[in-house]
Amino acid sequence: LRPSRVHNSEENTMRALTLKDILNGTFSYKTFFPNWISGQEYLHQSADNNIVLYNIETGQSYTILSNRTMKSVNASNYGLSPDRQFVYLESDYSKLWRYSYTATYYIYDLSNGEFVRGNELPRPIQYLCWSPVGSKLAYVYQNNIYLKQRPGDPPFQITFNGRENKIFNGIPDWVYEEEMLATKYALWWSPNGKFLAYAEFNDTDIPVIAYSYYGDEQYPRTINIPYPKAGAKNPVVRIFIIDTTYPAYVGPQEVPVPAMIASSDYYFSWLTWVTDERVCLQWLKRVQNVSVLSICDFREDWQTWDCPKTQEHIEESRTGWAGGFFVSTPVFSYDAISYYKIFSDKDGYKHIHYIKDTVENAIQITSGKWEAINIFRVTQDSLFYSSNEFEEYPGRRNIYRISIGSYPPSKKCVTCHLRKERCQYYTASFSDYAKYYALVCYGPGIPISTLHDGRTDQEIKILEENKELENALKNIQLPKEEIKKLEVDEITLWYKMILPPQFDRSKKYPLLIQVYGGPCSQSVRSVFAVNWISYLASKEGMVIALVDGRGTAFQGDKLLYAVYRKLGVYEVEDQITAVRKFIEMGFIDEKRIAIWGWSYGGYVSSLALASGTGLFKCGIAVAPVSSWEYYASVYTERFMGLPTKDDNLEHYKNSTVMARAEYFRNVDYLLIHGTADDNVHFQNSAQIAKALVNAQVDFQAMWYSDQNHGLSGLSTNHLYTHMTHFLKQCFSLSD
């Protein structure tokens, strides 16, 4: 719960937030996600680093792995085998890209309290996981996949063609990791561990991005990453399945690609096991408005996988791209052929549909002018999902249960009235068979995690309520937050406004717009945060606003697909429109308005500054995209098509920041980028800087040597300190 406001005499004891508070993470919160190991048991790492097993039904707990064992190998993570015999301990974590990292793995035998000796795992390993049943191990080492029947056994090598930056087996290449799978792995065990499916990515023909990593040596290193930019050659993907019981018998079998997909460039988008002998693959055309879901069956006689055309389901968008950010994945029901899936209904809202035979005959399960966001779990009698239906606030998330065992199916909101003021944005984590579940509430009040009975929805206990945070905030003057909407030309613009603690409508305040604005994003959410903008409002007396304009998510396809093939136009227009509306509210000093954003937000903030409206005095772009020709194919082409003459080259060319260099003359611009940004390459800011210099336009810039897209560590402190000075100078605020 947010601390209640204190008035008059007591107000003197309260202090504003400081930048130091933010940089030290003084007011960060904790969440509790149980590591479920059965219907009624979960593991959790205690404050003193013991791994503890909790049994919900007995209310009892005991340590299964001591902190001493963890410390003996400097373990930072662990994983219990499903047969409960072994634990892998992960150490020497070394980050690669957003999800990927390498690590050293040790196997600990819980039965005898000793590490498994003999046939130890090689190091460093790129990915490792237990089979879903028993204690088989699959792992990826040097881009090849290996299998162990038991942890102490010698490994069986499944693939042999793995090669750094060329062939990736069981792990994605850069673009699949970042823009398609959003995981560090590309292998999937069948439910009982009989089969192992994996992807092979061939990056041989992909152009390479190369940048300097300065380090401490006399000569900088060059980092080379196969990275397909818009219109470039893409990875070639193949899916294989191997029988892990007799891996040498027939070897890996390739799963056929649907003919309508294979006829031109395509992507693999996800794999879902249905049973041990049925698998579901999703494919996507390079022009990402056609997706095919293909259900394949194992043929015992031929030892191959058969994907009949009758089990191909096509999803097509006529108004934009397929899906939201990604194409949704199916959740299969107990009959192992029908499934539940979220896609657009006839009114252009993303909803849950039940598909039994064909997509055309799909039964719509949810409907309304709101969107279903995620299907968490389907049991014999219930379907649990999240949506933003409640009270028509798109930036909320509540958990619902639909009874599918009865007709007509009844719907119940599990979370809507639990802690109504404190909690309006939830996610959930379910145990086996949804016997129990944890709810994690992210706000708008102080986050809280609770445990619930899966049959009655009754709260069993509080897992984490952030009491220390609540106490720490008692003497802090937090800003006020409002979430409201503007109606402009048949478009609804939701905004969040962060106001100084002693906000007075009759006074004038400087305004900072914080923007992201990327396709299928959402910035206006009912979540708790004490961050940099909280400080700017609390201590520096600024008003901060976040606006979800066209292109943003969870409000229907009309808003979402408005930016299709036209990035950089409506997102910017809607920020400008909102600023004009804020000025009309009467408390904004129109001579002191700024805009800032990071990544896509850096692109939008740059275009807004260069819009020639005269609205903005200054602005900041952190790691901005400056031309869509410089960004990744999978992401960019989803929204922009191809940069070819017969497709959308014209808009690629006229949506660049560089084309507007001249318009920066009348604003103060701060451009910031990390030199080792693997995602939005430094090239983007280098080209903006070059264009500004060529146009003889003055600007400020800061680079962060050897830092990636996240600008982490000490760079974070430097970054926010630097941006604070810039804004205070822009707004004529004393330091």
């Epitope: 059965s38 039904e57 007995t58 005991y62 299964i64 001591s66």
Partner: nanobody, 116 residues
């Protein structure tokens, strides 16, 4: 602290059967997951089978189809029915929580000897 008492071991010929029992007493109730473990001479202790509080069972590959784990919550006991016994099943058999706690307190165990 929980006390665990194993019984039912003995000498049996290959192909024969035995039924082991484990009685649990003390502060931790029988609803916790329980497992049977064994230690052969000169070897390390290993898991044989486990049973969760909801009755879900798990077996190591070498005993699948021959051994059956069951539980009687009313009597706080866990059983291991061992059929088609092999010489390599010879070991001291122990019961404990599944997985065992740290530090693990093991009972005396019960000796199973399978002769050829």
């Amino acid at each position: 602290q929980v006390q665990l008492q194993e019984s039912g071991g003995g000498l049996v010929q290959a192909g024969g059967s035995l039924r082991l029992s484990c009685a649990a007493s003390g502060t931790m109730s029988s609803i916790n997951a329980m497992g049977w473990y064994r230690q052969a001479p000169g070897k390390q202790r290993e898991l044989v089978a486990g049973i969760l509080s909801d009755g879900t069972t798990k077996y190591v590959e070498s005993v699948k189809g021959r051994f059956t784990i069951s539980r009687d919550n009313a009597k706080n006991t866990v059983h291991l029915q061992m059929n088609s016994l092999k010489v390599e099943d010879t070991a001291v058999y122990y019961c404990n929580f599944f997985p065992p706690p740290v530090p693990a307190s093991w009972g005396q165990g019960t000796q199973v000897t399978v002769s050829s």
